[in-house]
Amino acid sequence: KAMHVAQPAVVLANSRGTASFVCEYASPGKATEVRVTVLRQADSQVTEVCAATYMMGNELTFLDDSICTGTSSGNQVNLTIQGLRAMDTGLYICKVELMYPPPYYMGIGNGTQIYVIDPEPCPDSD
């Protein structure tokens, strides 16, 4: 059995550099502990943006210094990435792992292309 992960193809960050998207997974088993990781792929480089482990029915908890926040509802995770700038435009991949109980499963989404446009600076007022 494979675990399917779905996420939107494209998302546009708002003027404050915040982008939100839903990561949904089809669980092959009854997991009680799930880990969600956001990966950024640029060229052939893959870097971890943020990760959170949560118990089903509980809230996601990212580290205090994380640029991500999120909420979970069943097999759906609502992810928000903050503090994005134009240079952060890229493909953001949602990885879901069913950590417990066994067996372990991993699923990887096709990625969400997040476009970030830096706001124009306000003109100086005399």
Partner: antibody, heavy 109, light 103 residues
């Protein structure tokens, strides 16, 4: 190293060059002249661990993220545990993308 | 994995097969190369994506239960043992290996 049947041995693997706590870490073994056999994995913060049936109850995998070190405690060793033991990093997408050079463990009386 | 051993000459094309006992996601099929006395090296992941630094003469394909590793033109350093692996669920399993030897 050489160890007698029934005895114990602890392997360690020191990693560098990446964020250790962001990766699952595996042990894989290879008996002389044979193929690769997955042994155990430990995830991120060390709470979740999985073992091959052949070593369950005898081997314990652990990690020290502050020292970037992976361990394999092998108890009640048997002749069939004789193998080269490799540590391997689980890449972000899952495959084992970096491997240690391997340690030969010989169980013999 | 088949064949168990493949006898070929440098410059020839090598086609290695990996058949799973049940359908697996192509996202989670990898190929490794192991030269004598060395640790395995990741060649292909996700059935068809080349790992960092792997020459483009190596390519992977397949889906479901049948996967293939192709080496378009064998170089002297390519004579080694090749393993396929599924890594989408526990336990992580390897094929028994295919040895590519010089004819």
């Amino acid at each position: 190293g050489v160890v007698q049947p029934g005895r114990s041995l602890r392997l360690s693997c020191v990693a560098s060059g990446f964020t250790f706590s962001s990766h699952g870490m595996h042990w894989v073994r290879q008996a002389p002249g044979k193929g690769l056999e997955w042994v155990a994995v430990i995830w991120y913060d060390g709470r979740n661990k999985y073992y091959a049936d052949s070593v369950k109850g005898r081997f314990t995998i652990s990690r020290d993220n502050s020292k970037n070190t992976l361990f394999l405690q092998m108890n009640s060793l048997r002749a069939e545990d004789t193998a080269v033991y490799y540590c391997a990093r689980g890449g972000h997408f899952g495959p084992f993308d970096y491997w240690g050079q391997g340690t030969l463990v010989t169980v013999s009386s | 994995q088949s064949p168990g051993t493949l006898s070929l000459s440098p410059g020839e094309r090598a086609t290695l097969s990996c058949r799973a006992s049940q359908s697996i996601s192509s996202s989670f099929l990898a190929w490794y190369q192991q030269r004598p006395g060395q640790a395995p090296r990741l060649l292909i992941y996700g059935a068809s994506s080349r790992a960092t630094g792997i020459p483009d003469r190596f390519s992977g394909s397949g889906s479901g239960t049948d996967f293939t590793l192709t080496i378009s033109r064998l170089e002297p350093e390519d004579f080694a043992v090749y393993y396929c692996q599924q890594y989408g669920t526990s336990p992580w399993t390897f094929g028994q290996g295919t040895k590519v030897e010089i004819k």
